[in-house]
Interface confidence: low
């Protein structure tokens, strides 16, 4: 503790020139005190006679310190260490709203010299957040801001964000962005973010997670072409067709919305009806041939097939022996081009 | 006309590989969720695994993540599922199914693990 | 993950019946959750998606309603041809399906 009036300590002392002023080789630092536990402040010098803490103005009692001394390799003059303990109860026995603070006073023969101030704070983190990430759900590729502002804390806690319990790294995955101000900014929501992020704040006494937000990535659906008309219900007169298109161009995901429109389109159709053909009447036998052979024909025009109707079926001359017909000697052939029929006359024998 | 057909089922040792197709007709597969889904025998319906090639996003069950990968190969517009450190619990009917409600399913491939 | 939590597990019920079988999810999925029929040794059938939707070709005595996480499966008047399996599913990645709910004839 300090002792502000049962010992005083020289202001000076006896100097000789030939000795620099003091120069710390170690300063004190400023320290946290975590929970109930003390902080040591330590300090070196030399050229040093004596070296004292001075806490918020107040030498410390000398039976407080820890002194040692020791010859410095390289110069060979003798340093001097010296620490002190603060504990959580002189701290927050310092009414004011200055901190504790402490700092070293070194001597040797040319005088004084005083060590920077190390400020003593007791550690601490509140356990509510100032504001959590809030669950949203976003469309693919759409920037994705969660915010975050951590407890009071000191020191000022950290932040860093988890995606499903796995610290983001922004080194890592340049999509991901912490701001200054411990916000995470995801630049382009990929499907893959969808997950569960939770901000941390973590200082020296302790680590707090904040609620979680569930991230989800969605994508609404669009319709794919639409597909060929079916053919017409009806293979002749009227009739329905119909065609169909699915929302899978993209399927939507994770809650997206579904296509409006219609899945499926009816029309009217109308199928002209195939019309079959059929024979016309046979013609008159023709007249007995040089082959003793007379014919008749016929044609599929009655009525001719249309619109993809059946062709007659059967043959389209007839033909058969006739006795009546006068047939000639050395008779062609009714391949001949030259062939033709003969009309019976007196001069044909009759057989 | 839709139309999902699975192969590449069969009996293997526990520890062993398959590797499980789908191929798709009738729709474009890498503008659609593209599933695998498996039924233990008397059992109900487990998802096992994921892919939307539109996105190139790729999604797996927990109790498959690191041992199966799904795939696809959208110019033979098939999916894929490449199964490896097979376990007894891995045997299952394997379907495909399309679309995030699944709207068409295959008719299923049988995967036995069994020493 | 996100639980589907089906209900009942199996039931009995006569031709002509109303059927109801729900899920609960065990956190918000939107209207993203479908039902699907299954007969033993056939691939699982859509009946319902986003809820409430009927697939194109499901008879018009299937019905999908929700309210807030819960969803449930309603069949108006049951046919011999309904007896069967029913499963739920959510479709936020990763995906999960309920136990299922077999339909038995009393």
């Known amino acids: 503790g300090t002792d502000s009036g049962s010992e005083v300590l020289p202001d000076s002392f006896p100097s000789a020139p030939a000795e620099p002023l003091p120069y710390f080789l170690q300063e004190p630092q400023d320290a946290y005190i975590v929970k109930n536990k003390p902080v040591e402040l330590r300090c070196r010098a030399f050229p040093a006679t004596q070296i004292y803490f001075k806490c918020n103005g107040e030498w410390v009692s000398q039976n407080d310190h820890v002194t040692q001394e020791g010859l410095d390799e390289a110069t060979g003059l003798r340093v001097r260490e010296v620490q002190i303990e603060v504990s959580r109860q002189q701290v927050e026995e310092l009414f004011g709203l200055e901190d504790y603070w402490c700092q070293c006073v070194a001597w040797s023969s040319a005088g004084t010299t005083k060590s920077r101030r190390a400020y003593v704070r007791i550690a601490y983190l509140r356990k509510n957040f100032d504001q959590e990430p809030l669950g949203k759900e976003v469309p693919l590729d759409h920037e994705v801001l969660l915010q975050c502002r951590p407890p009071e804390g000191v020191p000022v806690a950290e932040v860093e964000w988890l995606k499903n319990e796995d610290v983001i790294d922004p080194t890592q995955d340049t999509n991901f962005l912490l701001t200054i101000d411990h916000n995470l900014i995801i630049r382009q929501a990929r499907l893959s973010d969808t997950a569960n992020y939770t901000c941390v704040a973590k200082n020296i006494v302790a680590k707090r997670r904040s609620t979680t937000a569930t991230v989800i990535v969605y994508v609404n659906g669009g319709w794919s072409s639409w597909a060929e008309w079916s053919p017409c219900s009806n293979r002749c007169g009227r009739g329905w067709q119909k065609r169909t298109r699915t929302c899978t161009n993209p399927a939507p995901l994770n809650g997206g919305a579904f296509c409006e429109g219609q899945a499926f389109q009816k029309t009217a159709c109308t199928t002209i009806c195939p019309v079959d053909g059929a024979w016309t009447e046979w013609s008159k036998w023709s007249a007995c041939s040089t082959e003793c052979a007379h014919w008749r024909s016929r044609e599929c025009m009655a009525p001719p097939p249309q619109n993809g109707g059946r062709d007659c079926s059967g043959t389209l001359l007839d033909s058969k022996n006739c006795t009546d017909g006068l047939c000639m000697q050395n008779k062609k052939t009714l391949s001949d081009p030259n062939s033709h029929l003969l009309e019976a006359s007196g001069d044909a024998a009759l057989y | 006309e839709v139309q999902l057909v699975e192969s590449g089922g069969g009996l293997v040792q526990p520890g062993g590989s398959l590797r499980l197709s789908c191929a798709a007709s009738?729709?474009?597969?890498?503008?659609?969720?593209m599933h695998w889904v498996r039924q233990a025998p008397g059992k109900g319906l487990e998802w096992v695994a994921s892919?939307?090639?539109?996105?190139?996003?790729?999604s797996y069950a927990d109790s498959v993540k690191g041992r199966f990968t799904i795939s696809a190969d959208t110019s033979k517009n098939t999916a894929y599922l490449q199964m490896n450190s097979l376990r007894a619990e891995d045997t299952a009917v394997y379907y495909c199914?399309?679309?995030?409600?699944?709207?068409?399913w295959g008719q299923g491939t049988l995967v036995t693990v069994s020493s | 993950d996100i639980q589907m939590t089906q209900s009942p597990s199996s039931l009995s019920a006569s031709v002509g019946d109303r059927v109801t079988i729900t899920c609960r999810a065990s956190?918000?999925?939107?209207?993203?959750v479908a039902w699907y029929q299954q007969k033993p040794g056939k691939a699982p059938k859509l009946l319902i998606y986003?809820?409430?939707s009927l697939y194109s070709g499901v008879p018009s005595r299937f019905s999908g309603s929700r309210s807030g996480t819960d969803f449930t499966l309603t069949i108006s008047s049951l046919q011999p041809e309904d007896f069967a399996t029913y499963y739920c599913?959510?479709?936020?990645?990763?995906?999960?399906f309920g136990q299922g709910t077999k339909v038995e004839i009393k």
């Open positions: 199914a399309r679309h995030y409600a699944m709207d068409y």
């Open positions: 009738g729709f474009n597969i890498y503008y659609s969720y």
């Open positions: 892919i939307y090639s539109y996105s190139s996003y790729t």
């Open positions: 956190q918000s999925v939107s209207s993203a």
């Open positions: 986003s809820a409430s």
């Open positions: 599913q959510q479709s936020y990645s990763p995906f999960t």
